[in-house]
């Protein structure tokens, strides 16, 4: 019950996590005017991994996209490809761990197939973080680098017009956005990790043991799984395990990575 | 066509009150701003304050706080200044101009015509 | 306050010849939002209130004859009647219009020589 509710939980924080770094990647508020000098502006700056954005006094906002690539900084791509990156494994992830759900039944799957996919999700959900937060970090080291600069305005050059510009930028909201969002994917990574060792407790306690007769093999297993001999392909046992189907003799001759504690 | 009609000349005493009218018509009134710029005797322009009919967020010039108040009145699509505490030296041609909206972004395309206002003991 | 100076205070110009307004601001008008200036020129005529002329330092408003011209980015800015006619005859006024409280030029007078 409690792998099921971890296992659970870890999925609902990660889908908050990943929805958090689309919402921050789409954002227009990585960079805003620093107000400290002149608090007081009829038109208030702001920059996002795309576009950058005016709004004034009136209510008016208008926003210009990025329409070039090349001429856009370095740092700036890279931010761009880590959420792009962290965004894409964080979704195939999410759809790996909606059939590894234990609540969820498909056809035949073995727990210890449901642990795999737990695993493998719960990797892609910390590795999806962790580029969702070097992104934002680099994007915030680039905003302090940028600050103290007498132009601060760090993408000079952007769109091929030489900006002389006085505008001072500081942290927007998506980068509290995506650093709160990068930490959920992280952390519910995490549980799925901790609750892929939950997993068919009875499979994962013991090391499988194999009894060799002399003139067949009957590898057995606890936990009541059936003996079964090594005559014949045994076809109609096959089951999805591993990526691959095997017959429950290729399984339990060859012990996987959850049948160590 | 746009028009901003102002109310009529105003003469008044030292420490009184005025309160200047701008009727807009020809436009959805609470689509732009209203700005306030007066004009002393062969002086330059000076911007006093503006007001969002539609939020009725107002920003004012700091010279003015205090003394000025910019209201409008969506029903009649009117807007007021009233400046308090009046000197000599307020003095002015005071003109009322239609200035950016949610719409459109700011400056003054149409002005009222102008509302002197004299004080004088 | 931005202080915004312009030069001349007056200026005479013949018929058909070219005139030249200047306008600096103390701080950039420029904004990185969307690569605008926002500086504003208007026209005032004796007895009458002021005219938009251009605005975004080079946006000309319509209705407003191609001799005006609007040049410049930052804090430096350039008005330019390129053939100066009879009613061009007028004060000029720059604007900032980014930074409160907004902030007039001293005007330029501009007469026919």
């Known amino acids: 019950m409690a792998v099921t509710a971890c296992q659970g939980l870890g999925f609902v924080v990660s889908l908050i996590g990943i929805a958090g770094i689309i919402a921050a990647t789409c954002m227009d508020q990585w960079s805003t005017q620093d107000l400290y000098n002149n608090p007081v502006t009829a038109v208030f700056n702001y920059q996002g991994l795309w576009r950058s954005c005016v709004r004034e006094s009136s209510g008016f906002t208008e926003c210009r996209g990025y329409f070039t690539l090349l001429g856009l900084p370095a740092m700036l791509q890279a931010v761009r490809a880590l959420m792009i990156v962290g965004i894409v494994l964080g979704a195939i992830g999410l759809l790996v761990s909606i059939f590894a759900l234990k609540c969820i039944r498909i056809g035949s799957m073995e727990d210890s197939a449901k642990a795999n996919m737990t695993l493998t999700s719960g990797i892609m959900f910390i590795v999806s973080g962790l580029c969702a937060i070097a992104g934002v970090s680099v994007f915030a080291n680039m905003l302090v680098t940028n600050f103290w600069m007498s132009t601060a305005n760090m993408y000079t050059g952007m769109g091929g017009m030489v900006q002389t510009v006085q505008t001072r930028y500081t942290f927007g909201a998506a980068l509290f956005v995506g650093w709160v969002a990068g930490g959920l994917t992280l952390i519910g990574g995490v549980m799925m990790c901790i609750a892929c060792r939950g997993l068919a407790p009875e499979e994962t306690n013991y090391k499988a043991v194999s009894y060799h007769a002399s003139g067949h093999s009957v590898a057995y297993k606890p936990g009541g799984f059936k003996a079964s001999t090594g005559f014949g392909s045994n076809t109609k046992n096959k089951k999805i395990y591993d990526g691959g189907a095997r017959t429950e003799d290729e399984v339990q001759s060859y012990p996987s990575k959850h049948d160590y504690v | 066509q746009v028009q901003l009609v102002q109310s009529g000349a105003e003469v008044k005493k030292p420490g009184a009150s005025v309160k200047v009218s701008c009727k807009a018509s020809?436009?959805?009134?609470?689509?732009?701003?209203i700005t306030w710029v007066r004009q002393a005797p062969g002086q330059g322009l000076e911007w006093m304050g503006e007001?969002?009919?539609?939020?009725?967020?107002?920003f004012y010039n700091e010279k003015f706080k205090g003394r000025v108040t910019m209201t409008t009145d969506t029903s009649t699509s009117t807007a007021y200044m009233e400046l308090r505490s009046l000197r000599s030296d307020d003095t002015a041609v005071y003109y009322c101009?239609?200035?950016?909206?949610?719409?459109?972004?700011?400056?003054?395309?149409?002005w009222g015509q102008g509302t002197l206002v004299t004080v004088s003991s | 306050d931005i202080v915004m100076t312009q030069s001349p205070d007056s200026l005479a110009v013949s018929l058909g010849e070219r005139a030249t307004i200047n306008c600096r601001s103390s701080q950039s008008l420029f904004s990185s939002g969307n690569q605008k200036n926002y500086l504003t020129w208007y026209q005032q005529k004796p007895g009458q209130p002021p005219k938009l002329l251009i605005y975004w330092a080079s946006t000309r408003e319509s209705g407003v004859p191609d001799r005006f011209s609007g040049s410049g980015s930052g804090t430096d800015f350039t008005l330019t009647i390129s053939s100066l006619q009879a009613e061009d005859v007028a004060v000029y006024y720059c604007q900032n219009d980014y930074y409160y409280p907004l902030t007039f030029g001293g005007g330029t007078k501009v007469e026919i020589k």
């Open positions: 020809g436009y959805t009134f609470t689509n732009f701003g």
């Open positions: 101009a239609r200035g950016g909206g949610p719409l459109r972004s700011r400056y003054f395309d149409y």
């Open positions: 007001i969002y009919p539609s939020s009725g967020n107002t």
